[in-house]
Interface confidence: low
């Protein structure tokens, strides 16, 4: 092969001598340098030589970054010239032109990772968050990766973003609570690492819920409180009905009986139970969120102002970890969540025309089960198109959570969502064109 300098003035002077030597070598040695005769139409070095059928000889190819400026003959090898700017040839070739450099097409979702050189075409890949949807030796068109729903993550392929996301469930002990093309499953929080205990196990879509360790509880207390939780609303209803009846029908005897009934304390309860030693009843099977705190699971949204009051300071001194509300989904409440509050003396006292209640009043302010939802109720999440592994049956949707009151101090239940932060954005699939 001859490079451009061979055709310059000094090169031409040496030309006849060089060609004469080539002729002698070709005649005397069958293993000579190109051009050389080939009867079987194959050349020794197929990468760097090619068969020229017109003359039945093997000639040199031009190296990468060059092209054929003059074809070979029986007495002269191929003459090569360097590719002009913005053109290239990648391989040993016998092309008479260089190929034009093409930019990466952003409309097609491609971005440049290496510029074009005389020896290599522009290197492109799919933009972050995209995958190669059209492939013809190289990627020509990228499309947006599809989201993986909560409880799943994109199975991470290697470097070539040649395929769309394949969403796989989070492995055991991990969760992912967003719809995203790149969010990765995160390990469940280990409550014990933070000096807390598990209140509700994590699922594939939500983190473990943590709470402060509770002191041992007298077994009979929870029974008493369960009675109270169920009977108090009933007692109120009866009280109101009776009062209404007293006013309406003027039955003084009935009013007197009611007064004497309300002066009694609930059976088996002493005057001063120890503050803080009481456990509220476990979730009722039909009203599972009656005693559960309304704490949202963390979502992949910014903690912008939601118009909610700030969480009150807990008496035990544990900072309340506030999670941003995910306004797109119903809060997922797990059965069995418990809370701990301080209490004074429990009892119902009616004196004269007024009624004093010391103790915990549970006010159920949710919609009537089975009834139409109110205008302020969040819609229940539609059933997702994939299975959700849950530790327990979720309660009926749409139930609000009551707060507990004791005198003038308001105490939020100390159940916490530990470490529940919006999941980190993981890698986005990327594609590199190899040539």
């Amino acid at each position: 092969m001859l490079l451009p300098w061979a055709t310059s003035a000094p090169g031409l002077a040496w030309g006849p001598l060089v060609l004469g030597l080539f002729g002698l070598l070709a005649a005397s040695q069958p293993q000579a340098v190109p051009p050389y005769a080939s009867e079987n139409q194959t050349c020794r070095d197929q990468e760097k030589e090619y068969y020229e059928p017109q003359h039945r000889i093997c000639c040199s190819r031009c190296p990468p970054g060059t092209y054929v400026s003059a074809k070979c003959s029986r007495i002269r090898d191929t003459v090569c010239a360097t590719c002009a700017e913005n053109s290239y040839n990648e391989h040993w070739n016998y092309l008479t032109i260089c190929q034009l450099c093409r930019p990466c097409d952003p409309v097609m979702g491609l971005e440049e990772i290496a510029p074009c050189t005389s020896k290599r075409k522009t290197q492109c890949r799919c933009q972050p968050g995209m995958f190669c949807a059209a492939w013809a030796l190289e990627c020509t068109h990228c499309e947006l990766l599809s989201d993986c729903p909560p409880g799943t993550e994109a199975e991470l392929k290697d470097e070539v973003g040649k395929g769309n996301n394949h969403c796989v469930p989070c492995k055991a002990g991990h969760f992912q609570n967003t719809s995203s093309p790149s969010a990765r499953c995160q390990p469940h929080t280990r409550c014990e690492n933070q000096g807390l205990v598990e209140a509700a196990p994590g699922t594939a879509q939500s983190d473990t819920t943590c709470k402060n360790p509770l002191e041992p509880l007298p077994p009979e207390m929870s029974g008493t409180m369960l009675m109270l939780a169920v009977l108090l609303p009933l007692a109120f209803f009866l009280l109101l009905a009776t009062v209404f009846s007293c006013i309406w029908k003027s039955h003084p005897s009935l009013c007197r009986k009611l007064g004497s009934l309300l002066k009694r304390r609930p059976q088996g309860e002493g005057p001063n139970p120890v503050a803080g030693s009481w456990e509220p009843p476990k979730a009722h099977p039909y009203f599972p969120d009656l005693v559960q705190p309304l704490l949202p699971i963390s979502g992949d949204v910014s903690p912008v102002s939601t118009g909610l009051p700030a969480a009150p300071v807990l008496e035990a001194g544990v900072p309340q970890q506030q999670s941003p509300l995910d306004l797109t989904r119903e809060p997922q409440l797990e059965p069995g969540e418990q809370s701990q509050v301080a209490h004074g003396t429990n009892g119902i006292h009616v004196t004269g025309g007024s009624m004093t209640i010391t103790g915990n009043i549970y006010i159920y302010n949710g919609p009537v089960l089975g009834g139409p939802p109110g205008p302020g109720d969040l819609p229940a999440t539609p059933e997702p198109p994939y299975p959700i592994p849950e530790e327990g049956d979720p309660g009926p949707p749409g139930l609000s959570t009551p707060h507990q009151e004791d005198g003038k101090a308001w105490h939020l239940a100390e159940t916490e969502h530990c470490g529940a932060t919006p999941s980190n954005r993981g890698p986005r699939n990327q594609f590199i064109t190899h040539d």
Epitope: Q123, P128, L156, D158, E159, K162, P427, I432
Partner: antibody, heavy 113, light 107 residues
């Protein structure tokens, strides 16, 4: 020219630690999936770990999970492999590579008492 | 994990021979397969990616074919510099896995 150069190999006792470095030139490590491979003496190639271009979740072979940590320093344009609790079977030549399939020349790690 | 089975584990051939190496995946990997060449004391070099695409600068005597689970690397006319060990590698999913290698030596 795109190049990778590993360093940090050597002789270490079982249970010991080593930190391998991979210095990149001609490209930025933050733009590519970066990988570590290894090859035990007389054996085949084995993938060890990868880290994505956006610096997201790393991936590890089961044989090194919990012991090895892949990381990178974009300011130094370098990739690292922190190897703890080393075992005899970790003895190998360790190569770093990028997703354009540029490989380093390798660095030898020998775990022996 | 996806297992990659390469055969033969070694072969002897002469310059100019046509050489074929096969690689089988334990499950469908589409076309996410690479072929590497490694010479003693050197790092591997990529020959083929995406099962059949020739890496830039690699001689055209190397070619790859196959899709799904069965793949082939062919050297159309073996050259002296081709005596080396060849590995296939799947990159369909993590963990990335290699075949056991095929050593090509001089007959």
């Amino acid at each position: 020219e795109v190049q990778l150069l590993e360093s940090g190999g050597g002789l270490v006792q079982p249970g010991g630690s080593l930190r391998l470095s991979c210095a990149a030139s001609g490209f930025t490590v933050s733009s590519y999936v970066m990988k570590w491979f290894r090859q035990a003496p007389g054996k085949g190639l084995e993938w060890v770990s990868s880290i994505s271009g956006s610096g997201g979740r790393p991936f590890y072979a089961d044989s090194v999970k919990g012991r090895f940590t892949i990381s990178r320093d974009n300011s130094k344009n370098a990739l690292y492999l922190q190897m703890n609790s080393l075992r005899a079977e970790d003895t190998a030549v360790y190569y770093c590579a990028n997703d354009m399939d540029v490989w380093g020349q390798g660095t030898t790690v020998t775990v022996s008492s | 994990d996806i297992q990659m089975t390469q055969s033969p584990s070694s072969l002897s051939a002469s310059v100019g021979d046509r050489v074929t190496i096969t690689c089988r995946a334990s499950q469908d990997i589409s076309s996410f397969l690479k072929w590497y060449q490694q010479k003693p004391g050197k790092a591997p070099t990529l020959l083929i990616y995406a099962a059949s695409a020739l890496q830039s600068g690699v001689p055209s005597r190397f070619s790859g074919s196959g899709s799904g689970t069965d793949f082939t690397l062919t050297i159309s006319s073996l050259q002296p510099e081709d005596f080396a060990t060849y590995y296939c590698q799947q990159y369909n999913t993590y963990p990335l896995t290699f075949g056991g290698g095929t050593k090509v030596d001089i007959k």
